[in-house]
Each structure stands twice: as structure tokens, then as C-alpha cells.
Amino acid sequence: GPVWRKHYITYRINNYTPDMNREDVDYAIRKAFQVWSNVTPLKFSKINTGMADILVVFARGAHGDFHAFDGKGGILAHAFGPGSGIGGDAHFDEDEFWTTHSGGTNLFLTAVHEIGHSLGLGHSSDPKAVMFPTYKYVDINTFRLSADDIRGIQSLYGDPKENQRLPNPDNSEPALCDPNLSFDAVTTVGNKIFFFKDRFFWLKVSERPKTSVNLISSLWPTLPSGIEAAYEIEARNQVFLFKDDKYWLISNLRPEPNYPKSIHSFGFPNFVKKIDAAVFNPRFYRTYFFVDNQYWRYDERRQMMDPGYPKLITKNFQGIGPKIDAVFYSKNKYYYFFQGSNQFEYDFLLQRITKTLKSNSWFGC
């Protein structure tokens, strides 16, 4: 059967049952995911907007799939095996009375069972297993998975020791404090810094230690994942986002219609198929576009490329290059260049590197 081909899995609670406090629902669902993460390399994180891998829904009767609920009793919940769209989603019958204890139907115990399905497990014939098809209350304070449950889930995902860092081909949420973390694109947006990676972005509000991870699609549903370059013209409230040979314009955090457009409208020659990084310098009103080992300079007022470009990155940015992943402008005098897991604070007035940092140094790692 299907399995998640990644170890970082997001979930979202779409709506809340009125039978319980919201905090109790959050806690029951979190603890249910924890039951499975304790015995596998899987890591689960809750997101509040956008497309999660696993959507938790409370619904009654017909609710958007072929498997309508049947009122109180009978079917308590169902969940779809791993996959895109409805894949992984767990639906709980709102006609049940959901509780934190032995009365009604215990949400935690039901969720452990349904999340088992969300992860790819079928039913067990062992009456002691949480994946046994019928509901039976057990003391949640002493609850443990049966040997059969553990055997089943570890046959799909392995045990927790196998949690060595995986490459990220499937756009699972990267670990923010992984020392090897690199970014696809970085830009300021007002007093915030956006760090893009795969289908996610982190939001860092200046001078505050807290950062939050979000799906790009939750903020801008029409934009693709894998943004490769980004820059801001703050005076115009504009952000430009690049992927492949296309770019999108965001004005006041809203995507403009009639985008994407071709990057060649900036005046790049045809051989340029994508932009690695971009940064706007408001002092000179110029945007620097980095492509492989070269860069172009674009005059935002005249809307045309400056003559004499491209130039080699290594020639004009001492100690930077030959290629970069991302760059942003800050504090009126610095470019922050990102190369893999390293970051360089570059004083463009002194024209030299003033600090070497890890790429994720902004997150208090």
C-alpha cells in the first residue's frame, strides 16, 4: 500500500468539534501523532493555514467524499491512506460525542487509530492492537501501542534510529535548525524577512526571535513551490518572485493579475533560463540579478539593463561566488549572500565580507 515518501509530515485541524475545548482537541491530536512519531523516524508539525499533508475534519453525514457518516454509533471516523489531495486526511463523525475521557468516544484513541490509516496501516486482527477495527476504551494514561502496531508501522517507516537526514526530493518541511540547511530565495518584505525553501517559507519579523513556517500556497495559492529568487522594492510595496523563466509580481502582499511573465522582459539574453538570486539596492535604485557565475544590473527607474553586463560575481563581490543561492539587502549597507549552508554579510560600501554565518543564523539556532 502507499506510504509517505518523506519524514516530515504536516497536519492541519480544519475545524473543531463543539463537544470539547479547542485546546483539548489540539492536545488529543498532537498526542495521537506523537504515539506514531515515538516509534518511527516520522516528525509531525501542525500548520494553521494552507495545504497540509493530513487534514483533520469533523463532519456529519455526507461531507465531501463517497463515505458519508451514519449518525451516532456505527462508523466513528475514517482516514485515507498516504497521498496527495484527500490522501492522509482523517474525518471524524460529528454525530459522535467526542471526549477526553471514557465517556462518549475518546478522541485521542480514535485519532491514534485513524492516523495509523493516514500513515498507511490497514486493520489488525490482534484485539490488543490499536489498529483492531473496533473501538474499545483503554486508560489513555497507560495507553501503549501493541507489538503488532509497532511491527506494522516500522515495516513501513523503520524505527526512530533511522532518522538520519534525508535529501528533500519530496518537498517535506526542512528542519529549520539543521546545520546543512540552505535556502532557495530570501527577501525582505517590509520589516519581515521571507526565507523560501521548496514549498515552504519562514517568516522572520525583524528583531524578534520567533519564526513561523508556512506553505507558499497558503499565502499565495496561485504561486508555485520552489521559488528560486526574490527581491523587494519597498517604496513601491512590490515583491518580485522568480521560478524558471517566469516571474510573479506581488503588490501589497497580493499577487498581481496577468502574471507570471517571462524573465526576458527584463532584457536577459535567451540563454538565461532561470535566476539564482536577486536583490534591489534602494540607494542606487538598481536590482542585481545573479545567474550562474555572473550578474546583471537592472535600472528600475528606466526599466532597462545597465550597459556592460553581465560581469563575473567573483570579480566585483570580493569573496563571494562563483555562484550564490540567495541574497537580500538590509540595514542600508549590507547584502546577505547565501551559498549552501553558509551566509556572508557583505558591506557594499566597503566592498568586502564583514561576517560569515550559518544560513539559518536568523532563527536563533
Epitope: F66, H67, P221
Partner: antibody
Framework: EVQLLESGGGLVQPGGSLRLSCAAS????????MHWVRQAPGKGLEWVSG????????FYADSVKGRFTISRDNSKNTLYLQMNSLRAEDTAVYYC???????????????WGRGTLVTVSS | DIQMTQSPSSLSASVGDRVTITCRAN??????LNWYQQKPGKAPELLIY???SLQSGVPSRFSGSGSGTDFTLTISSLQPEDFATYYC?????FGQGTKLEIK
């Protein structure tokens, strides 16, 4: 390459019966939900029936409940629709469609056959 | 029971136009909405699933958005091959269809 090939359509009188078949190839048939969807001439699409991987559960549109029976033979990679007590309003092109999922149906049809025409007329 | 209302039922547009088709459910269907394209005499083809995910091989000028009850299919710049009928669908319920014709 995934292929779904419907057969068994034709002209039948009101009250008559017909059995449609859908031969599947290019994918492992047994784990997936399968469905029948129809389209009356010049009209829109109407879902008719769906069946789970091992022959159950089965679901039907209200308009065909009690008259049509969906079944499958996983050893032959074939889906069937037995249509009894046919009415003029059952005249349509009948498509066989593969669901993207097993276990529970997502109702997401990633592959369709070319259809077979059923005409109910006296 | 869940019902899907698709609008408009027909639409005339020119090559290069941006076109939007909407689909509304009478109750929340989360993001469980799919869009299909059908050309005359052909079987429908899946374009968008789960409201906004582009099916493999479908051009990026097609995009979907929405959740809950309101959904849209957008074609950013119409191409000659896009003139067809479009259906939204959720489980066993299809919208009435939108016929997109050349102006």
C-alpha cells in the same frame, strides 16, 4: 500506459437489460476503486456507480439504485455494469473511470475510457 | 445532500484572454474539488485535483483555487486548444459544465 476499454453498449428497448464491461490494462487493477460515469447526448457528466477494490463496498446514484449493479473480476482486470429495467433517460455514453485511490474512494478520476454508447429506445 | 453549482454555463473568449470559471458547493467540501476538461467526442481529462494541484502534464496556464464552498478554475492566457467544456466535480457530484467557445 493505462488503458480502459468499454464494451457492451448498443440499442435496447425500454425495460430491457444490458451488461457493460471495462477491460483495464497498464496498471495493477485490484487495489483501486473503479467507477462508471455517463453522459447523455448534449448533456453534462453524471456519476453512476463506484466499487471498492475487493468488490465492496458499492455505491450508486439515486437515479439507478435498484436497477444497476456494479461488479468486478480482479483476476480478469475487468469492471462490469449490469443494467436492468432500462429507461429512455438512461441513454448516454457510459465511461469507465479509475479512481486515484484504494481503501476509501477519493472520487478523483485520473484515467477514463473512451466510452460506450447505450441507446434505450423503442 | 451536497450540490455543486457551476457558472457561467457558457463563455465566449479570445485566444490570449484570461478566463475564470467558478464552482460553488452548498456546504463545505474542504479542498475536495477537481476540475476536468472535455473536448467534443472525447473522454474527460483531469486538470486540477484537490482544488489547486495541477495534474501531471497539464500546462501551467491552468490553475485552481478555493476551499470550503467557493472554487475557481483560471486559464491565464487562452490557447486555441483550450476551447472545450469544463466540469468541476466532488466525489459523485459534477457541476453542470461550462462551455468555453471562441469569440
Amino acid at each position: 500506459e493505462v488503458q480502459l476499454l468499454e464494451s457492451g453498449g448498443g440499442l435496447v428497448q425500454p425495460g430491457g437489460s444490458l451488461r457493460l464491461s471495462c477491460a483495464a490494462s497498464g496498471f495493477t487493477f485490484s487495489p483501486y476503486w473503479m467507477h462508471w460515469v455517463r453522459q447523455a447526448p448534449g448533456k453534462g457528466l453524471e456519476w453512476v456507480s463506484g466499487i471498492g477494490p475487493s468488490g465492496g463496498p458499492t455505491f450508486y446514484a439515486d437515479s439507478v439504485k435498484g436497477r444497476f449493479t456494479i461488479s468486478r473480476d480482479n483476476s480478469k482486470n475487468t469492471l462490469y455494469l449490469q443494467m436492468n429495467s432500462l429507461r429512455a433517460e438512461d441513454t448516454a455514453v457510459y465511461y469507465c473511470a479509475k479512481d486515484i485511490r484504494g481503501a476509501y474512494s477519493s472520487g478523483l478520476f485520473d484515467y477514463w475510457g473512451r466510452g460506450t454508447l447505450v441507446t434505450v429506445s423503442s | 445532500d451536497i450540490q455543486m453549482t457551476q457558472s457561467p454555463s457558457s463563455l465566449s473568449a479570445s485566444v490570449g484572454d484570461r478566463v475564470t470559471i467558478t464552482c460553488r458547493a452548498n456546504q463545505s467540501i474542504y479542498t475536495y474539488l477537481n476540475w476536468y476538461q472535455q473536448k467534443p467526442g472525447k473522454a474527460p481529462e483531469l486538470l486540477i485535483y484537490a482544488a489547486s494541484s495541477l495534474q501531471s502534464g497539464v500546462p501551467s496556464r491552468f490553475s485552481g483555487s478555493g476551499s470550503g464552498t467557493d472554487f475557481t478554475l483560471t486559464i491565464s492566457s487562452l490557447q486555441p486548444e483550450d476551447f472545450a467544456t469544463y466540469y468541476c466535480q466532488q466525489a459523485g457530484i459534477f457541476g453542470q459544465g461550462t462551455k468555453l467557445e471562441i469569440k
